[in-house]
């Protein structure tokens, strides 16, 4: 009689993540008497992966019905496929002996390979503000995919980058892996609308690319433009200066008004306009009373913005040609957002 | 479900015999092996063997060989394990487990003394 | 025949703590035949870890199993008042299947 051959007919096998494998084995002949045990990977440290008659595997079923008394068919289903399962498989038949069952004769090898789809792509940005004509970085993660070919791409409100560094790990072979790559990106005044898109495309998408995406709005700082001018007189002894606070972003400012180099008034912007481009413009205006003076008057509107160092604007105010109001110790008079009086 | 339902317990002499029995439900009963392991009071777990129910094939721990006598009856679902020659010392829980290690059965007191 | 060696005998912690404990084989035993198994007075032990680190249906995540060779380990991260119990390492890897003695994870 001819000597047992144990068969694996599928030199390879391709299968997606989550799904199930099936692993196909038959012998050739029931003598030797003797059990099929599945491992995977060769060697003393090879994995078993299912055991006919001993042991816990609770995603392996069999195909058929191992007790039947002439079954010849070992072929496996492994379910919830992971990329960790890849590997080679094979299908060793034993036989009986003592203490322990001896291998007699192994199938060749099925080789499992796993289609596993990229993570969405994180896209992250600086962790500081950066300010228009400012190269900026920025970092696009994605992981646990398989096979290794992978496509990845940069826009800027849809107009692709080319300046950009990618790397994918590792450079051997594993059971997944994971892409990074960096970016450059030089900011505008108009950036604050603008999207950083990460872009990538795997076998596993089916044409289908995934996208990450970081709104710049996170990254700029559009520092204002300051504008401080007087304005006719409103009342006798009184002069309205105003402070225009152009094209700014983020929202977070802070204004102070200084007289010959004294604080006046301090103020948040609240309420703000928008401008199409996304950046804010805010105003404020103080109403000097110039009988208060003896001199001419040095106004500054002083602004903090988003934490920076503070920028400002100076406008001189001349007293001279104004009488000076008797009993008046009224040196400003805020007429802003809420209407206070300052002493 | 899987079930193992083993028999009562059992006081004996020392010298005699005891025969524990291990009846399976919910599970094809020649798939896999059934192993006995015992516990003596206060004490570890102890393999005493196995036998495989689709064709009665045996291993033992050799500690055992000589007293113990595994057997099976395919046509009810039920392993037997028998021990001869008992001592005190065999005193203890014995249990039938699955060859998958997750299901045991209840466990049965057997209680040596004369 | 290969000997497990469980340590410690012992172990007194209180509920929340981290529990580490370990299994040593007198030769290598392959990671695939490695089991942990849970005993709590009057019942039959409980399969946690199969495969020296795959958890078993039902078993809590904090729950779990590391090592190969000859050096393996049972990891409880944060102990819930019914983790007091014995556990037990046991190797199929070769005749005769052997269990360690055991671990006692008492309240401290």
């Known amino acids: 009689e001819e000597e047992l051959q144990v068969i694996q007919p599928d030199k390879s096998v391709l299968v997606a993540a989550g799904e199930t494998a099936t692993l196909r084995c038959t012998a050739t002949s029931l003598i030797p008497v003797g059990p099929i045990q599945w491992f995977r990977g060769a060697g003393p440290g090879r994995e078993l992966i299912y055991n006919q008659k001993e042991g816990h595997f609770p995603r392996v079923t069999t195909v058929s019905d191992l007790t039947k008394r002439n079954n010849m068919d070992f072929s496996i289903r492994i379910g919830n496929i992971t990329p960790a399962d890849a590997g080679t498989y094979y299908c060793v038949k034993f036989r009986k002996g003592s203490p322990d069952d001896v291998e007699f004769k192994s199938g060749a090898g099925t080789e499992l390979s796993v289609r596993a789809k990229p993570s969405a792509p994180v896209v992250s940005g600086p962790a500081a503000r950066a300010t228009p004509q400012h190269t900026v970085s920025f970092t696009c993660e994605s992981h646990g995919f398989s096979p290794r070919d992978i496509t990845l791409k940069w826009f800027k409100n849809g107009n692709e980058l080319s300046d950009f560094q990618t790397n994918v790990d590792p450079v051997g072979e594993s059971v997944s892996y994971s892409i990074h790559s960096t970016a450059k990106v030089v900011l505008t005044r108009e950036d604050v609308h603008s999207q950083v898109i990460c872009e990538v495309a795997h076998v596993t998408l089916q044409g289908d690319p995934l996208r990450g995406t970081a709104n710049l709005s996170e990254t700029i700082r559009v520092p204002p433009t300051l504008e401080v001018t007087q304005q006719p007189v409103r009342a006798e002894n009184q002069v309205n200066v105003t402070c225009q606070v152009r094209k700014f972003y983020p929202q977070r400012l802070q204004l102070t008004w200084l007289e010959n180099g004294n604080v006046s008034r301090t103020e948040t912007a609240s309420t703000v306009t928008e401008n199409k481009d996304g950046t804010y413009n805010w105003m404020s205006w103080l109403l000097v009373n110039v009988s208060a003076h003896r001199d001419d008057v040095k106004l500054t509107c002083q602004v903090e913005h988003d934490g920076q160092p503070a920028v400002s604007k100076s406008h001189d105010l001349k007293v001279s040609a104004h009488p000076k109001e008797q009993g008046s110790n009224t040196a400003a008079e805020n007429t802003g957002s809420n209407e206070r009086n300052i002493y | 479900q899987v079930q193992l339902v083993q028999s009562g317990a059992e006081v004996k002499k020392p010298g005699a015999s005891v025969k524990v029995s291990c009846k399976a439900s919910?599970?094809?009963?020649?798939?896999?092996?059934i192993h006995w392991v015992r516990q003596a009071p206060g004490q570890g777990l102890e393999w005493m063997g196995r036998i495989d129910p689709a064709d009665g094939d045996t291993k033992h721990n050799p500690k055992f060989h000589d007293r113990v006598t595994m057997t099976v009856d395919t046509s009810t679902n039920t392993a037997y394990m028998e021990l001869s020659s008992l001592r005190s010392e065999d005193t203890a829980v014995y249990y039938c487990?699955?060859?998958?290690?997750?299901?045991w059965g209840q466990g049965t007191t057997v209680t040596v003394s004369s | 025949e290969i000997v497990l060696t469980q340590s410690p005998a012992t172990l007194s912690l209180s509920p929340g703590e981290r529990a580490t404990l370990s299994c040593r084989a007198s030769?290598?035993?392959?990671?695939?035949?490695l089991y942990w198994y849970q005993q709590k007075p009057g019942q039959a032990p409980r399969l946690l870890i199969y495969s020296a680190s795959n958890l078993a249906s039902g078993i809590p995540a904090r729950f779990s199993g590391s090592g190969s060779g000859t050096d393996f380990t049972l990891t409880i991260s944060s102990l819930e008042p019914e983790d007091f119990a014995v556990y037990y390492c046991?190797?199929?890897?070769?005749?005769?299947?052997?269990f360690g003695g055991g671990t006692k994870v008492e309240i401290k």
């Open positions: 919910g599970f094809n009963f020649e798939d896999t092996y």
């Open positions: 030769s290598s035993v392959t990671s695939s035949y």
């Open positions: 487990v699955r060859g998958n290690y997750v299901n």
């Open positions: 046991h190797q199929w890897y070769s005749y005769p299947r052997t």
